[in-house]
């Protein structure tokens, strides 16, 4: 009889995670007598996955029954496949003896398991900015393999370029892990804006998986603060109103000052949202002219989303309403219009974007 | 290593029955088939039967046929021949044998079970 | 159904000596591209031990003096110097079709 061989037939097998693989190997010979065994890699630490004499291997299953008559077919099924089981496989011949000696492996079969990545989880700033600046978002997925993926951001549909991604490990592993870094100008507009994050993979058959974010958990848009005089009524009293617009997120509290001190506090609370996902506050304040000998200095004071506040301040001029209605020209505005938050008083520069 | 193990010697009379066991260890024992055999005192081997025990696929000795039975129990990995009607002539020492290469031979024996008969 | 019958029924060896015992089937035991053909030495109060296997092949830790041979219906055991301790009874075994024994083969020391 010729000199027994073993084949392993394929050099390489791929299989998905979850499914099963199919690791081929014969004999050529019946003799000698003697059982076969698995084992993933080489030398001394190799790993024995199967032994069709002894053990127990609920993962495993001999493609053929080892009791069938001449059998030298000794392939074997690995079921529930992971990123775990990549490997080199070898298929090894022993004689039987005390104990059965080994006498002749297979070329080995390299298992690589296709893996797909996990759903991108994309995450953004710890803190809110304002328009104008750049933020960063952070997509992560794990678990693949092969060690190719194809990464892409896009805000708004628009694909980004200004990104910086990594796969790691760098060198051989089971399964691999991307992180991608990519850096978002914010405009105004943004409160309604997304950004994608998209993973192709291989595994994935062309569909590719998305994470996505909100700009608005990123973005904050200071308001514009106007106040305005109505109207004196027949009553002596004036209305002035503070108008606060166009601000995200909606958390804002508005304080009423006449002439510094403390008139009225109230807080934002269920606003309509405007188009641009922005909201829009209306205050009003009263202001008894009759019952003040001089000129009421009157500040609509802001706070919006734990900032330091924004002061808007107005004057109502006593002296201009001797008891005429209809008229506001003697009101004067001291206060300023400028996105930078100085307020009349020019005390505070505060520039948090 | 290989090792069966036989239940102890029996006495048995003519009409009865008897089942002897075999115990395996050292191997996978659903992944090789147990023969029996038995040798009459100062006779030759004569084969009764065999049983795989991944799946109790039995292959008897006509001659046995009607009045031998093999089973497994997995769990244990004992195997067991159940011969029935005993006869005088049935005395004999009863091994089990395991095929380590499914050629249909015998690797390794048992010590052997003594069955008499006698009235 | 295959019949074994082996010859002689007995013989005596010098030691040292060539023992030689035959087996002749009743039909062809080839199958398959082999020769289903098994020998066994039984020494007193043991059980039988597998010498060769497939006509020509010998077991793990069977002296190399013992060898076998023959191929379709006549098949040989062959002991090239006999030792004291190869006194036993020798059988051949088919497995073409299902087992089945020679009547065995006592070897004694001349």
């Known amino acids: 009889e010729e000199e027994l061989q073993v084949i392993q037939p394929e050099k390489s097998v791929s299989v998905a995670a979850g499914e099963s693989a199919t690791l081929n190997c014969t004999a050529t010979s019946l003799i000698p007598v003697g059982p076969i065994q698995w084992f993933r890699g080489v030398g001394p630490g190799r790993e024995l996955i199967y032994s069709q004499k002894e053990g127990h291997f609920p993962r495993v299953t001999p493609v053929s029954d080892p009791t069938k008559r001449n059998n030298m077919d000794f392939s074997i099924r690995i079921s529930n496949i992971t990123p775990a089981d990549a490997g080199t496989y070898y298929c090894v011949k022993f004689r039987k003896g005390s104990p059965d000696v080994e006498l002749k492996s297979g070329a080995g079969t390299e298992l690589s398991v296709r893996a797909k990545p996990s759903a991108p989880v994309v995450s953004g700033p710890a803190v809110r900015a304002t328009a104008e600046h750049t933020v960063s978002f952070t997509c992560e997925s794990h678990g693949f393999s092969p060690r190719d993926i194809t990464l892409k951001w896009f805000k708004n549909g628009n694909e980004l370029s200004d990104f910086q991604t990594n796969v790691d490990p760098a060198g051989k592993s089971v399964s691999y892990s991307i992180r991608s870094t990519a850096r978002v100008v914010l405009t105004r507009r943004d409160v309604h804006s997304q950004v994608i994050c998209e993973v192709a993979h291989v595994t994935l058959q062309g569909d590719p998986l998305r994470g996505t974010a909100n700009l608005s958990e990123a973005i904050r848009v200071p308001p514009f603060l106007e106040v305005t005089q109505q109207s004196m009524r027949a009553d002596n009293q004036v209305n002035v109103t503070c108008q606060v617009t166009k601000f995200y997120p909606q958390r804002l509290q508005l304080t009423w000052l006449e002439n510094g001190n403390v008139s009225r506090t109230e807080m934002a609370s269920a606003l309509p949202e405007n188009k641009d996902g922005t909201y829009n506050w209306t205050s009003w304040l009263l202001v008894n002219v009759s019952a003040h000998r001089d000129d009421v200095k009157l500040t609509c004071q802001v706070e919006h989303d734990g900032q330091p506040a924004v002061n808007k301040s107005f004057s109502v001029k006593v002296s201009a309403h001797p008891k005429e209605q209809g008229s506001n020209t003697a009101a004067e505005n001291t206060g300023t219009n400028e996105r930078d938050y100085k307020d009349d008083d020019d005390k505070h520069h505060h520039h948090h974007h | 290593q290989v090792q069966l193990v036989q239940s102890g010697a029996e006495v048995k009379k003519p009409g009865a029955s008897v089942k002897v066991s075999c115990k395996a260890s050292?191997?996978?024992?659903?992944?090789?088939?147990i023969n029996w055999v038995r040798q009459a005192p100062g006779q030759g081997l004569e084969w009764i039967a065999m049983i795989d025990p991944s799946d109790s696929e039995t292959h008897y000795n006509q001659i046995f046929k009607d009045r031998a039975t093999l089973t497994t129990d997995t769990s244990t990995s004992t195997a067991y021949m159940e011969l029935r009607s005993l006869r005088s002539d049935d005395t004999a020492v009863y091994y089990c044998?395991?095929?380590?290469?499914?050629?249909?031979?015998?690797?390794?024996w048992g010590r052997g079970t003594l069955v008499t008969v006698s009235s | 159904d295959i019949v074994l019958t082996q010859s002689p029924d007995s013989l005596a060896v010098s030691l040292g000596e060539r023992a030689t015992i035959n087996c002749r089937a009743s039909q062809s035991v080839r199958s398959s591209g082999y020769n289903w053909i098994f020998w066994y030495q039984q020494k007193p109060g043991q059980p039988p031990k597998l010498l060769i296997y497939?006509?020509?092949n010998r077991d793990s830790g069977v002296p190399d003096r013992f060898s076998g041979s023959g191929s379709g219906t006549d098949f040989t055991l062959t002991i090239s110097s006999l030792q004291a301790e190869d006194v036993a009874v020798y059988y051949c075994?088919?497995?073409?079709?299902?087992?089945?024994f020679g009547q065995g083969t006592k070897l004694e020391i001349k």
């Open positions: 497939l006509a020509s």
């Open positions: 044998a395991m095929d380590y290469g499914s050629l249909y031979a015998m690797d390794y």
């Open positions: 050292g191997y996978t024992f659903t992944n090789y088939w």
């Open positions: 075994q088919e497995s073409r079709e299902l087992p089945t």
